[in-house]
Interface confidence: medium
């Protein structure tokens, strides 16, 4: 979650992550090229609402100030931990060229070659150590280890890093060995659900573009709004069918059959007073999908959800009603009414997949997570285009911790606020080939909305 270059004893003690860009040591944050400068981290200081009522007891409060209070602030369209990259949607040495929008398409509409590129890219990401970032394996006050001299960090693969980010956003606050405090979720149960997962996907998409050397590589989506009792992406051509001899595992004909999961053993980390360190913890599992004759959401559910005009409503939590966000996340029924017995849309899709995908802390281990969230983001984008909300639609305060408009999304680094992602996909350099206004056209003629 932090750049390797900053995770030194000095960096941690000084709480400063302002690396030089290139070999010139004085080119801090690309300052000599006018790209950025080292600056105090701005954090949201407005009050949040329950259920997290503690103060100064969690690493993620005032993110990322428990770790770094000075980072690179990039100018213009420059971005990255050393201002060496461009903001999403921009390219060129000076980041002043609008990148042609990439197109996220239905996974079923990909050609065999495109499909292979996507699946191969995921597999490559699973096997490639992240070149720039490391994960922390201890909580903030134990970050320098028992002797106070050794940053507690670990390398992990690009895909496992993607998983770790999600785990870290939902893990418990740990008050002591074996005593978790379960009251916090920085990426679900509040308005940040949509922006957090949007940034999460953009991050992965950019990593896959780097890995494949293809700047126009786009994540596909899985239109899970079929109303069916089957997972039509759980095939060996796509994300792996069930194994004949053990249906909870993935068929040996799929490259995903050998994928091992990380960050699954929450209770174990709480007991051992540690964080997920990227150790493999067993094979990816999908228990019987659609158990109890459960059915996936329908297109009608999507349309009902899109007809809700309010982005979110107090208390901006899982019990908000007539809230587009809460209906999309799936705590409300699709029409915005609350029924605590019912799961819908995004939540229902996760639950339907069962296994690894049904638990928030481990869900991202399953590559179905990527295409499921890509479709969820497509629905969010359709809502943005239809409603063109002002930033005032997002609560400035009294959302749960992490969900206020100006809160830096945990644990992304360098810091990025919810507000910065409350834009249409087009403004962020991508689009969806999807029409959510009626029955989606057959895959060979999928249209842009």
């Amino acid at each position: 979650q932090f750049p390797r270059v900053c995770m030194t004893l000095d960096g941690v003690l000084n709480k400063e992550c302002c690396p030089p860009l290139g070999p010139e040591a004085t080119n801090i944050c690309g300052f000599l090229e006018g790209r950025g400068q080292c600056a105090e981290v701005q954090t949201d200081t407005r009050p949040w609402s329950g259920p997290y009522i503690l103060r100064n007891q969690d690493d993620r409060e005032q993110w990322p100030r428990k770790f770094f209070n000075r980072t690179c602030k990039c100018t213009g369209n420059f971005a990255g931990y050393n201002c060496g990259g461009c903001k999403f949607g921009w390219t060129g040495p000076d980041c002043n060229r609008k990148k042609p929008a990439i197109l996220r398409r239905n996974i079923h509409s990909l050609t065999a070659q495109e499909r292979e590129q996507f699946l191969g890219a995921l597999d490559l990401a699973k096997k490639s150590i992240h070149p720039d970032y490391v994960i922390t394996t201890q909580h903030w006050l134990g970050l320098l280890g028992p002797n106070g001299t050794q940053p507690q960090i670990a390398n992990c693969s690009v895909y496992d890093f993607f998983v770790w980010l999600h785990y870290y956003s939902v893990r418990d606050t740990l008050l002591g060995p074996g005593r978790p405090y379960k009251a916090i979720d920085f990426s679900h149960q509040g308005p940040a659900f949509v922006t957090w997962h949007r940034y999460h996907l953009l991050w992965l998409e950019r990593e896959l573009q780097r890995l494949t050397g293809n700047e126009s590589f786009a994540l596909p989506y899985w239109n899970f709004a079929t109303g069916k009792n089957e997972c039509d992406v759980c095939t060996d051509e796509l994300l792996g069918a069930a194994r004949q001899d053990d249906p909870t595992l993935i068929s040996r004909n799929s490259r995903f059959s050998t994928w091992e999961i990380v960050c699954d053993s929450l209770d174990d980390y709480n007991r051992r007073v540690t964080l997920c360190n990227g150790t493999y913890e067993g094979l990816l599992r999908r228990n019987k999908v659609g158990r109890n004759n459960e059915k996936l959401p329908t297109l009608k559910n999507v349309q009902d959800c899109l007809s809700l005009q309010k982005f979110d409503s107090p208390p901006f939590f899982q019990n908000s009603t007539f809230s587009f966000r809460n209906a999309l996340e799936g705590f409300d029924k699709a029409d915005g009414t609350l029924d605590s017995q019912v799961m819908n849309l995004h939540n229902l899709a996760h639950s339907f997949l069962n296994g690894t995908n049904a638990l928030p802390h481990s869900a991202a281990n399953d590559p179905v997570f990527v295409v499921l969230h890509s479709f969820t983001d497509a629905i969010f984008d359709e809502w943005l285009k239809r409603n063109n909300p002002s930033t005032d639609a997002w609560p400035q305060e009294l959302a749960p911790i992490g969900h206020n408009r100006m809160y830096n999304m945990v644990p992304f680094f360098p810091p990025v606020t919810n507000e910065e992602l409350f834009l249409t996909a087009e403004q962020l350099g991508y689009n969806y080939a999807v029409d959510l206004s009626e029955e989606e056209a057959p895959v060979w003629s999928t249209t842009l909305s």
Epitope: H139, G142, G176, P177, G178, R179, R271, V273
Partner: antibody, heavy 112, light 107 residues
Framework: QVQLQQSGAELMKPGASVKLSCKAT????????IEWVKQRPGHGLEWIGE????????NYNEKFKGKATFTADTSSNTAYMQLSSLTTEDSAIYYC?????WGQGTLVTVSA | DIQMTQSPASLSVSVGETVTITCRAS??????LAWYQQKQGKSPQLLVY???NLADGVPSRFSGSGSGTQYSLKINSLQSEDFGSYYC?????????FGGGTKLEIK
């Protein structure tokens, strides 16, 4: 594994002060709260308060403010609780705890 | 401060029976509750954390349940080693108060 080792029993005079210690091993001492709990003979458990050794942050039960003071020494992984102006009401077993783990308790007896 | 009301205060039961101890919080504590067992002259031992999760090494005859303000600890098929005192404690904002305790005695 995680262990909390407390100092031995104390026999004190009324009005005196006593400092109890709790040495932690087996985990990163600085990062997690150490709590202090009082138990009078034949009574239940009373939460006195807690300290986060790495930052020195403390939370006290209102009832024990002015009576108990928490400190921690991160170099020896030891937390301390000082009890001042002792009265017979302070005679009790005092436990330190961190999460799921408890010390063996220190018996404090206040007697003239 | 949140008050924890534990009942019953004492209980006399035979080996092999099933018992349930309850704890009521004065406000919603969102499952941030622990149960402890304490034997005479010993430190409390954690049995259950976060209302429903069994701590390491605790036999499966113990189980925790509840949400909101109402919580309970159930012990199936009591064994002789289960006798002692039981306490609940909330972790929903300081002070982390305990229930008054339940003394479980052999009939």
């Amino acid at each position: 594994q995680v262990q909390l080792q407390q100092s031995g029993a104390e026999l004190m005079k009324p009005g005196a002060s006593v400092k109890l210690s709790c040495k932690a091993t087996g985990y990163t001492f600085t990062g997690y709260w150490i709590e202090w709990v009082k138990q009078r003979p034949g009574h239940g458990l009373e939460w006195i308060g807690e300290i986060l050794p790495g930052s020195g942050s403390t939370n006290y039960n209102e009832k024990f403010k002015g009576k108990a003071t928490f400190t921690a020494d991160t170099s020896s992984n030891t937390a301390y609780m000082q009890l001042s102006s002792l009265t017979t009401e302070d005679s009790a077993i005092y436990y330190c705890a961190s999460g799921a783990y408890w010390g063996q308790g220190t018996l404090v007896t206040v007697s003239a | 401060d949140i008050q924890m009301t534990q009942s019953p205060a004492s209980l006399s039961v035979s080996v092999g029976e099933t018992v349930t101890i309850t704890c009521r919080a004065s406000e919603n504590i969102y499952s941030n509750l622990a149960w402890y067992q304490q034997k005479q002259g010993k430190s409390p031992q954690l049995l259950v954390y976060a209302a429903t999760n069994l701590a390491d090494g605790v036999p499966s005859r113990f189980s925790g349940s509840g949400s909101g303000t109402q919580y309970s600890l159930k012990i199936n098929s009591l064994q002789s080693e289960d006798f002692g005192s039981y306490y609940c404690q909330h972790f929903w904002g300081t002070p982390y108060t305990f229930g008054g305790g339940t003394k479980l005695e052999i009939k």
